[in-house]
């Protein structure tokens, strides 16, 4: 067990703050909730506290939640290559680039850290050449989300991990929305982190309404599991 | 454009596509007698590139997002330089995310003919 992962035993309030600007609509999203890496449960809720928000909320989904990826839960065999984790309490920086197909982009950074028991995703999104009718800006998404795998690797040059998904957003026209995830995490401290075998996160997430909540929000219930590493041949003999 | 050995060159060239559709941009020379090649890629997510071994310490690849445009600086020329310049943009093949050498290249530039004399 990492030293960090032992901070992940029991239920961790999470706290998230974004503040975005996409095509210079500016907006901000406070997020308060909790999670459960025995579990890899997530239970969130997001208001937007300016007012209403510019984007669809579930283009943000990846940037809240995807966000805290500490909370995945690594079966035993797959411990040994969870990043995320390792890098508590210190935590880690998460740089994403988000395209959207035939339409504008997503920039985001985020420190992910402990503050006191609280773990904390503060992020910064910078949103440029969107359509002003587009998908996003049009508000065309269906507020839901579809299941996705998120495919890691270790990035030994910068003592961290890649990641690359690819996000099918469903449109009210019974389209789809491709958006693709190129993500890099880099430890803030200077302690020991797991790098890595190639595997991906298997992820389940549903978003609801709080039917006494008149601010525009977002109810998040998500579950992340790791897996695409096998048990190796001493496991099998045992 | 034409330069002498140990002059410098700056190519640019602008895509239309969208940022999905050209997550890597890169520059390709065909010069005499050989088959195209891969002079330097750029990964547009964060600026990750690649450099031919004859062109490492020479040549530098960048891009500017908001205009949609690749650059490549080229210094201390040499003959065997010479070439037409071709620039391309695409995505990464399936499996390879982070990998623009070997992208599948959609749009390809018209060229431009870089001379180096002696």
């Known amino acids: 067990m990492s030293k960090g992962e032992e901070l992940f035993t029991g239920v961790v309030p999470i706290l998230v703050e974004l503040d975005g600007d996409v095509n210079g609509h500016k907006f901000s999203v406070s997020g308060e909730g909790e999670g459960d890496a025995t579990y890899g449960k997530l239970t969130l809720k997001f208001i937007c506290t300016t007012g209403k928000l510019p984007v669809p909320w579930p283009t943000l989904v990846t940037t809240f939640s995807y966000g805290v990826q500490c909370f995945s839960r690594y079966p035993d065999h797959m411990k040994q290559h969870d990043f995320f984790k390792s890098a508590m309490p210190e935590g880690y920086v998460q740089e994403r680039t988000i395209f959207f197909k035939d339409d504008g982009n997503y920039k985001t950074r985020a420190e992910v850290k402990f503050e006191g028991d609280t773990l904390v995703n503060r992020i910064e999104l910078k949103g440029i050449d969107f359509k002003e009718d587009g998908n996003i800006l049009g508000h065309k998404l269906e507020y839901n989300y579809n299941s996705h795998n998120v495919y890691i690797m270790a990035d030994k040059q910068k003592n961290g991990i890649k990641v690359n998904f690819k996000i099918r957003h469903n449109i009210e026209d019974g389209s789809v929305q491709l958006a693709d995830h190129y993500q890099q995490n880099t430890p803030i401290g200077d302690g020991p982190v797991l790098l890595p075998d190639n595997h991906y996160l298997s992820t389940q997430s549903a978003l609801s309404k709080d039917p006494n909540e008149k601010r525009d929000h977002m109810v998040l219930l998500e579950f992340v599991t790791a897996a695409g590493i096998t048990h190796g041949m001493d496991e099998l003999y045992k | 454009g034409s330069v002498q050995t140990g002059g410098s060159l700056g190519l640019s060239c602008t895509t239309s596509?969208?940022?999905?559709?050209?997550?890597?941009m890169g520059w390709f020379r065909q010069t005499p007698g050989k088959e195209r090649e891969g002079v330097a890629t750029i990964h547009r997510a964060f600026g990750d590139t690649y450099y031919a071994d004859s062109v490492k310490g020479r040549f530098t690849i960048s891009e500017d997002s908001a205009k949609n445009t690749v650059y490549l600086r080229m210094n201390s020329l040499k003959p065997e330089d010479t070439g037409m310049y071709y620039c391309?943009?695409?995505?990464?093949?399936?499996?390879?995310?982070?990998?623009?050498?070997?992208?599948?290249?959609?749009?390809w530039g018209q060229g431009t003919q870089v001379t180096v004399s002696s």
């Open positions: 596509l969208d940022g999905y559709s050209s997550v890597c």
């Open positions: 391309a943009a695409g995505r990464p093949k399936s499996g390879s995310a982070w990998n623009c050498r070997d992208a599948e290249y959609v749009y």
